[in-house]
Interface confidence: low
């Protein structure tokens, strides 16, 4: 006996109780492929979900999340509460990002600021709860004769790399020594 069910198009199901006739999917159900023995129940977008695409006889409904929530999982299987930028969602609700971390989205977790020193660079713009730090040029780029399109790094701010600290300390020491010897020399001239 030929299987007539293979002739049943999407939007119908093969009803064996009716000599394998193609019956239309009942209300609120669908079949997305031909030859199906049953229709699938349409997804209902209720509560925190809202309908993005209505169910048709050949395709399931598609859901989105209502305002203030965002989709998680395949085909928006869950809705998670939005937070503000600079926050992350915890079990106790939205919490501000800790110092040294940021979140520039309404979803997800706070991430650590970029460690500019790992790339041998300096911090050009400090990080905030909402924004990552902006890395500037490396100390080597600041040496005389080095050409760089990047503007020079500002003075020391929290989060500066050890290279910069060492460079500034060395410069300060040399300047102090020079001043010290200049003063001594001046005194010697006075004594004569």
């Amino acid at each position: 006996l030929q299987d007539l069910c293979s002739n049943c198009p999407a939007g119908t199901f093969c009803d064996n109780n009716r000599s394998q006739i193609c019956s239309p999917c009942p209300p609120n159900s669908f079949s997305s492929a031909g030859g199906q023995r049953t229709c699938d129940i349409c997804r209902q977008c209720k509560g925190v979900f809202k309908t993005r695409k209505e169910c048709s006889s050949t395709s399931n409904a598609e859901c989105d999340c209502i305002s203030g929530y965002h989709c998680l999982g395949a085909e928006c299987s869950m809705c998670e509460q939005d937070c503000k930028q600079g926050q992350e969602l915890t079990k106790k609700g939205c919490k501000d990002c800790c110092f040294g971390t940021f979140n520039d989205q309404k979803r997800g977790i706070c991430r650590p600021w970029t460690n500019c020193s790992l790339d041998g660079k300096s911090v050009l713009v400090n990080g905030t709860k909402e924004r990552d730090v902006v890395c500037g040029p490396s100390p080597a780029d600041l040496s005389p004769g080095a050409s760089s399109a990047t503007p020079p790094a500002p003075a020391r701010e929290p989060g500066h790399s050890p290279q910069i600290i060492f460079f500034l300390a060395l410069t300060s020491t040399v300047v102090l020594f020079l001043l010290f010897f200049l003063v001594l020399d001046y005194k010697d001239d006075d004594d004569k």
């Epitope: 049943c8 198009p9 999407a10 939007g11 119908t12 009716r18 006739i21 193609c22 019956s23 239309p24 999917c25 009942p26 209300p27 609120n28 669908f30 031909g34 209505e54 169910c55 048709s56 006889s57 050949t58 395709s59």
Partner: antibody, heavy 117, light 107 residues
């Protein structure tokens, strides 16, 4: 705005073929089915067939041998072809949109076809 | 094929009347029944789908009921614009079939 519009030859000679086009707007043929229905003068409605979003078809068994429904999704057009017309095929031919639970929620205004020599 | 019979081919009623139009199927159709209104100019509109669900934009004076083989359309408070022919249609089994229609006139 959802609309369906039938366009046909008006007059067809007996034993000749009939071709009618249903042009739709405001929705996609990849989402909705289209059915053809006809109404002879002074008589009731007769379902001819349906073309599903995926392109599959079902026909009225009494007319299946001389009926063909096809479509062009990109042009938003559905085509009805009927062979070997006789005088009793004289009717107003409608296309109608088949919504998800198999009701015809939007109908065209219909096109009158007269089979006469 | 499933035969759909509308036993009353025409009926006359007054404005404000409650009118019931019946439709009978030659075998059980599991509530897979729709009702349509055809105006004298040939315009066809859906009124009721799946036996009793009111289509959007249709006045609430229209209602549908029934089960098994016997179904009906009721207009609770007849208005002059309800002058039309009413058709039932089954979609339980191919080929889908319409009733012969009931022409409603105003007295």
């Amino acid at each position: 705005q959802v609309q369906l519009k039938e366009s046909g030859p008006g007059l067809v000679a007996p034993s000749q073929s009939l071709s009618i086009t249903c042009t739709v707007s405001g929705f996609s043929l990849t989402t909705y089915a289209i059915s053809w229905v006809r109404q002879p003068p002074g008589k009731g409605l007769e379902w001819l067939g349906i073309i599903w979003p995926g392109g599959g078809t079902n026909y009225n068994s009494a007319l299946k041998s001389r009926l063909s429904i096809s479509k062009d999704n990109s042009r938003s057009q559905v085509f009805l072809k009927m062979n070997s017309l006789q005088t009793d095929d004289t009717a107003r031919y409608y296309c109608a949109r088949g919504a998800g639970t198999w009701y015809f929620d939007v109908w065209g205004a219909g096109t009158t076809v007269t089979v006469s020599s | 094929d499933i035969q759909m019979t509308q036993s009353t081919s025409s009926l006359s009623a007054s404005v404000g009347d409650r009118v019931t139009i019946s439709c009978s199927a030659s075998q059980g159709i599991s509530n897979y029944l729709n009702w349509y209104q055809q105006k004298p100019d040939g315009t066809v509109k859906l009124l009721i789908y799946y036996t009793s669900s009111l289509h959007s934009g249709v006045p609430s004076r229209f209602s549908g009921s029934g089960s098994g083989t016997d179904y009906s359309l009721t207009i609770s408070n007849l208005e002059p614009e309800d002058i039309a022919t009413y058709y039932c249609q089954q979609y339980s089994k191919f080929p889908w079939t319409f009733g012969g229609g009931t022409k409603l006139e105003i007295k």
